[in-house]
Interface confidence: medium
């Protein structure tokens, strides 16, 4: 778009006539205050379009913004709209008139606003005052727009001097309204109800003086209206609540309940929805899997957790080997069932410093008048391995034996290793593993016993060494899923007098 003369600001004489031309690659139009002006449009042979605006008998009231824009595009892109500001200095016009709504400036937050007092002559000095004060306020002035800044809730006037007379503008009133961006919260006494129970929902708005509530709900769609109740919770900061109450719910009342709130000052609106489920009868459902075999480590605390959904709230019982469990006064067992959401529960059995006797068959049962569920598992107590004995002996057969005894649960695994060069073992010489059947130098015999009462395995392993010709560092290492332990003994040849 090309405007001639280009502006962006023109100062024209009162009573004169002035011609403005705008041209572009599509039909163009001149506008002022969002209205098309009387103008002459033309199309040239080179397919350029133009519009000529003739301003005749100019007065101060012709002061203002003029726009040239492509017809029907309404300035989709910045370069599809050109702005021109015209001043017509006119001593008979003081301040340009404002529409009534421009005199009342409503604020909903602390923000910069413009008091739009404008004059026809850009050379005039304009000052801003509180309506009841003479002192000029230090606020920047733009002849095309007015005074811009952050203003308090007061009345303001603008002043200028034209010739030798002082001229006042109309008064501008700044009001700060209690309006916030609408933030709606919706909640229900229960989102799951059985048929015949009540549905009660609340929609709350905070920080607005005037709002309008509208509810959408399944019954409304079938033409059965429910009258909501609206009340004020607190005077400040304006808590307004709308309550929707449906007595004796039916299965058809399941669905989405939406609260829509609007406020008229800024035309803000917000809506929130909540789902309500009406069930024929109550339920209890397990969530997730709990393995049939659970483990706990001896002398450590272990929490066994079951997650389930239920409505209405259930009774929860725990059993061990078919005997009911309760919180022990000694603090060895703790039972808790937490409501983690409206219908979701976590039931926990905590065994404090687990003992061997606590191994066994555990069951959790959750029930109410409509349904029940139970879950069972076996608890195995894992005991870290420990080497109880490592001893060396010299049977008459001439061979030397090393016996290693240890216990643990699950069954310990035994590893024999040895180092011949004591000074360099094990840093520079890795220990050699013993007891492989292919080696004639050593033989291994291992026996495993399960001790029912202690609920753990005992491993006894005997290593037979055939030819010990120099001191040998022999190590017995036990390991299982929850630990490792080891002991070492120095085996010396028969001929040496020391150990």
């Amino acid at each position: 778009l090309v405007i001639t003369p280009p502006g962006p600001e023109l100062i024209l004489n009162v009573s004169s006539t002035f011609v403005l031309t705008c041209s572009g690659s599509a039909p163009v139009v001149w506008e002022r205050m969002s209205q098309e002006l009387p103008q002459e449009m033309a199309k040239a042979q080179d397919n350029t379009f133009s519009s000529v605006l003739t301003l005749t008998n100019l007065t101060g009231l012709d002061t203002g913004e003029y726009f040239c824009t492509y017809n029907d595009s309404r300035g989709l892109e910045p370069d599809e709209r050109k702005r021109l500001y015209i001043f017509v200095p006119d001593p008979t016009v003081g301040f340009l008139p404002n529409d009534a709504e421009e005199l009342f400036i409503f604020l909903t937050e602390i923000t910069e606003i413009t008091i739009p007092c404008r004059v026809t002559d850009p050379q005039l000095v304009v000052t801003l005052h509180e309506k009841k004060g003479d002192i000029a306020l230090p606020v920047p002035y733009d002849h095309q727009r007015g005074f811009s800044g952050i203003f308090e809730d007061r009345s303001y006037i603008c002043k200028t001097t034209i010739g030798d007379r002082e001229v006042d503008s109309d008064a501008y009133y700044v009001y700060r309204l209690q309006v916030s961006s609408i933030n709606v919260s919706v909640n229900a006494v229960q989102t799951v109800v059985r048929q015949g129970e009540n549905i009660t929902l609340m929609c709350i708005v905070i920080g607005n003086e005037v709002v309008n509530f509208e509810w959408m709900y399944p019954r409304k769609e079938s033409g059965r209206l429910v009258e909501p109740v609206t009340d004020f919770l607190l005077d400040m900061p304006y808590h307004i609540r709308s309550i929707l109450h449906i007595p004796s719910a039916e299965l058809e009342d399941s669905g989405t309940y939406t609260c829509n709130v609007t406020e008229s000052v800024n035309d803000h609106q917000d809506e929130k929805a909540i789902n309500i489920t009406v069930v024929e009868s109550g339920y209890v459902r397990l969530l997730g899997e709990v393995g049939a075999l659970q483990f706990a480590e001896l002398h450590r605390s272990r929490t066994l957790q079951v997650v389930f959904e239920a409505y209405p709230p259930p009774t929860v019982l725990w059993f061990k080997d078919n005997r009911t469990l309760g919180d022990s006064s000694a603090g060895e067992i703790a039972l808790s069932t937490r409501n983690v959401s409206e219908t979701r529960y976590v039931s926990e059995l905590t065994l404090v410093r687990v003992k061997v006797a606590e191994a066994g068959h555990y069951t959790m049962r959750a029930f109410h008048e409509d349904a029940e569920v139970q879950l069972s598992f076996q608890l195995q107590i894992n005991v870290p391995v420990r080497v109880l004995e490592l001893s060396e002996s010299h049977p008459d057969s001439g061979e030397q034996t090393v016996r290693c005894r240890g216990r643990g649960m699950p069954q310990p695994n035994i590893i024999w290793s040895a180092c011949r060069d004591l000074k360099r073992c094990p840093r520079e010489l890795p220990p050699m593993l013993l007891g492989n059947s292919s080696e004639e130098e050593s033989q291994l015999e291992t026996n495993v016993t399960y001790w029912e009462e202690e609920q753990e395995f005992e491993v006894v392993s005997t290593l037979r060494l055939q030819h010990v010709d120099r001191p040998l560092s022999v190590r017995c290492t036990l390991r299982n899923a929850v630990g490792q332990d080891m002991q070492e003994v120095i085996v010396v040849p028969h001929s040496l007098p020391f150990k």
């Epitope: 290793s417 094990p426 190590r475 490792q484 332990d485």
Partner: antibody, heavy 118, light 106 residues
Framework: EVQLVESGGGVVQPGRSLRLSCAAS????????MHWVRQAPGKGLEWVTV????????YYADSVKGRFTISRDNSKNRLYLQMNSLRAEDTAVYYC???????????WGQGTMVTVSS | DIQMTQSPSTLSASVGDRLTITCRAS??????LAWYQQKPGKAPTLLIY???SLESGVPSRFSGSGSGTDFTLTISSLQPDDFATYYC????????FGQGTKLEIK
Amino acid sequence: EVQLVESGGGVVQPGRSLRLSCAASGFTFSNYGMHWVRQAPGKGLEWVTVIWYDGSYKYYADSVKGRFTISRDNSKNRLYLQMNSLRAEDTAVYYCARGELGDAFDIWGQGTMVTVSS
Amino acid sequence: DIQMTQSPSTLSASVGDRLTITCRASQSISTWLAWYQQKPGKAPTLLIYKASSLESGVPSRFSGSGSGTDFTLTISSLQPDDFATYYCQQYKTSWTFGQGTKLEIK
């Protein structure tokens, strides 16, 4: 030259996951047990987890049990630490270290920093 | 779990000094104990293993002793390069470190 090089550290939000890697060179990786040890800023060393030379046994410190998983790929000479459900208290430099069965940690990596912060 | 307690937590010394750091285990660990040195921003390095065996490449001014529950690390003549933090570690049953001893220049 016997060497361990950690990678994969970084800044992560609480509750998120991270996977650390340790590349071994200069020794027969598949013969050795491998450990992860960590050190919180300005604090001491804390043993985290171990994996046997063949991957048959894995042990974890109580503070990471159920959240961290150690693994290894002997064909690639690599050790891994998968860290899930991370907490602020997991913020530390993480070292991988070589430690044979019943032996001290003779080779350490240079460490990789893990910061858990929202 | 086996706990390891080091003392002192901080130690001020001068070059040429002879000094001892002690480490106590909450239960017997035989001689399954190692000592490490760590400098700021670096990984630890092994000094002593099996309570008294010197790791190869470690200067002979470092020595370790002890068995059962009480152990010591001795530096016979302190060198400028020795100012660092020292940790003991048991590896009999699982693996646990002492809290560290910081060696500072007096």
